[in-house]
């Protein structure tokens, strides 16, 4: 069964910078990736980036750079200019489409131990979901 993994990582050098890494585990080629974010329990979500293997990428603030890492994984750099606890309680979701097979989504958030005062980010743990 295809699966999607998501890692959310705080940059060690800049506490207001985050990176979301997402990947697809399964057969087939990726036709589109959509990254979205919002509050817990599906509240107040919106798109951050859309990546098409041929047509390119589009991103919306606070996304800084969306890019393909491999043919089946992407990364999205985020810049937070807000409060002292950046992206706290924020859920990031990645949805990979493989046409015509189907599409799969998984979501993740910054691990609770990611205190802005830490000198280095924690090791991100993949979150897997197969619906």
């Amino acid at each position: 069964t295809p699966e999607v993994w998501v890692q959310v990582q705080m940059e060690a050098t800049e506490l207001s910078s985050f990176t979301v890494h997402c990947g697809f585990l399964g057969p087939g080629s990726i036709s589109l990736v959509t990254v979205s974010w919002g509050g817990p329990d599906g509240a107040g979500g919106t798109k951050l980036a859309v990546l098409h293997p041929e047509l390119g990428t589009r991103q919306w603030a606070p996304a800084r750079q969306a890019r393909w890492e491999t043919q089946s994984s992407i990364s999205l750099a985020l810049e937070d200019s807000g409060a002292s606890s950046p992206f706290a309680n924020t859920t990031f979701c990645c949805k990979f489409a493989s046409f015509p097979e189907g599409s799969w989504e998984s979501c993740g958030s910054l691990p609770p131990s990611s205190d802005p005062g830490l000198s280095a980010p924690p090791t991100p743990v993949p979150i897997l979901r197969a619906d």
Partner: nanobody
């Protein structure tokens, strides 16, 4: 796995109304823009309407403006298309899709350019 299941299609007389529904599962529906696209017999895929994630912004192709209304109920994970004053030229298979084709300014659409897609529901407008 993401699933989008359309319903509500059928045969209707010109001037009549139909309400299409799209039940979504397997993803965080409330985070995503959703659209309706259609494919008339022997024609290519045509964008019909898009609604943003919270339902606050909608857009329509000129040919359906004032006749069709897109809406969503995020608490029910459902997308709707209310179609009034139907015309013969509205006859098509209607697909519920995740995404907004305007992201890339697509002129010739394909279902593969969307993040998720349903199996479609047939709407026939005929007397």
């Amino acid at each position: 796995e993401v699933q989008l299941v359309e319903s509500g299609g059928g045969l209707v007389q010109p001037g009549g109304s139909l309400r299409l529904s799209c039940a979504a599962s397997g993803f965080t529906f409330s985070y995503y823009d959703m659209s309706w696209v259609r494919q008339a017999p022997g024609k290519g895929l045509e964008w019909v309407s898009t609604i943003n994630s919270d339902g606050g912004r909608t857009s329509y192709v000129d040919s359906v403006k004032g006749r069709f209304t897109i809406s969503r109920d995020n608490s029910k994970n459902t997308l709707y298309l209310q179609m009034n004053s139907l015309r013969a030229e509205d006859t098509a298979v209607y697909y519920c899709v995740e995404g907004d084709p305007h992201n890339f300014g697509l002129e010739s659409l394909s279902l593969r350019d969307f993040g998720s897609w349903g199996q479609g529901t047939m709407v026939t407008v005929s007397s």
